[in-house]
């Protein structure tokens, strides 16, 4: 005897209780492939999570985190907290970055300003918790008698003749 | 494949206990540190505790500390989180999570793999 439940499609379920005729999907729930004997409930994308797909008979809702949080996990099971650029996620929460650290993003740790003189460069610009130290020419460069009365010439652009 | 499964969860009344378990694969468990995670229904990931590799430290949320325990056995490759004095607000999907050292504390957010989680719901 045929199965009749492998030609119900997506979208419907075999009713055994209707002599396996396709009945379509409750409200609120899917099939996403063929010959099924129900429909799986749609997800819900509530609190913290906001809904980025809406639920079809055919395909299950999808989740996205609302502002403030970003997704973690398969299908965005989870939604961790952003933090400000200058602080990083700990497990109390968020904290700012420690002296000498910085993260100029929302998400990961906060990490150790650039030691320019690793180097042989200076600092040219202090670094703060948000952003990273800039390292300019090494101190030798500076040093009094070391630069050139001429500016250095500006480099040309590849295929453009000097002016 | 890494993979952690979490199971123990259930219905229960404030005051209540709870046991769960979270059984791990694909990586040498005892080398890692591992933490419990929740999620309540409105609010983002809340770290519960954390345990180090070989059990000997362990840490706490304030909001759980006295109630909770977490524990290990390497020679199951297991970790568990006995939960004492329910409260309503420890209605949340718990998750197990790996972390990326042996050793740990109550600061350094570094779990690198999560389980599926399971639901606990405190309600009279």
């Known amino acids: 005897l045929q199965d009749l439940c492998s030609n119900c499609p997506a979208g419907t379920f075999c009713d055994n209780n209707r002599s396996q005729i396709c009945s379509p999907c409750p409200p609120n729930s899917f099939s996403s492939a063929g010959g099924q004997r129900t429909c799986d409930i749609c997800r819900q994308c509530k609190g913290v999570f906001k809904t980025r797909k809406e639920c079809s008979s055919t395909s299950n809702a999808e989740c996205d985190c609302i502002s403030g949080y970003h997704c973690l996990g398969a299908e965005c099971s989870m939604c961790e907290q952003d933090c400000k650029q200058g602080q990083e996620l700990t497990k109390k929460g968020c904290k700012d970055c420690c002296f000498g650290t910085f993260n100029d993003q929302k998400r990961g740790i906060c990490r150790p300003w650039t030691n320019c003189s690793l180097d042989g460069k200076s600092v040219l610009v202090n670094g703060t918790k948000e952003r990273d130290v800039v390292c300019g020419p090494s101190p030798a460069d500076l040093s009094p008698g070391a630069s050139s009365a001429t500016p250095p010439a500006p480099a040309r652009e590849p295929g453009h003749s000097p002016q | 494949e890494v993979q952690l499964l979490e199971s123990g969860g259930g219905l229960v009344q404030p005051g209540g206990s709870l046991r769960l378990s979270c059984a791990a694969s694909g990586f040498t468990f005892s080398s890692y540190a591992m933490s419990w995670v929740r999620q309540a229904p409105e609010k983002g990931l809340e770290w519960v505790s954390a345990?180090?590799?070989?059990?000997?430290?362990?840490y706490y949320a304030d909001s759980v500390k006295g109630r909770f325990t977490i524990s290990r056995d390497n020679s199951k490759n297991t970790l568990y989180l006995q939960m004492d004095s329910l409260k309503a607000e420890d209605t949340a999907v718990y998750y197990c999570?790996?972390?990326?050292?042996?050793?740990?504390?109550?600061?350094?957010?570094?779990?690198?793999?999560w389980g599926q989680g399971t639901t606990v719901t405190v309600s009279s």
């Open positions: 345990i180090s590799g070989g059990g000997g430290s362990t």
């Open positions: 999570a790996k972390e990326g050292t042996t050793e740990t504390d109550d600061y350094h957010y570094n779990m690198d793999v």
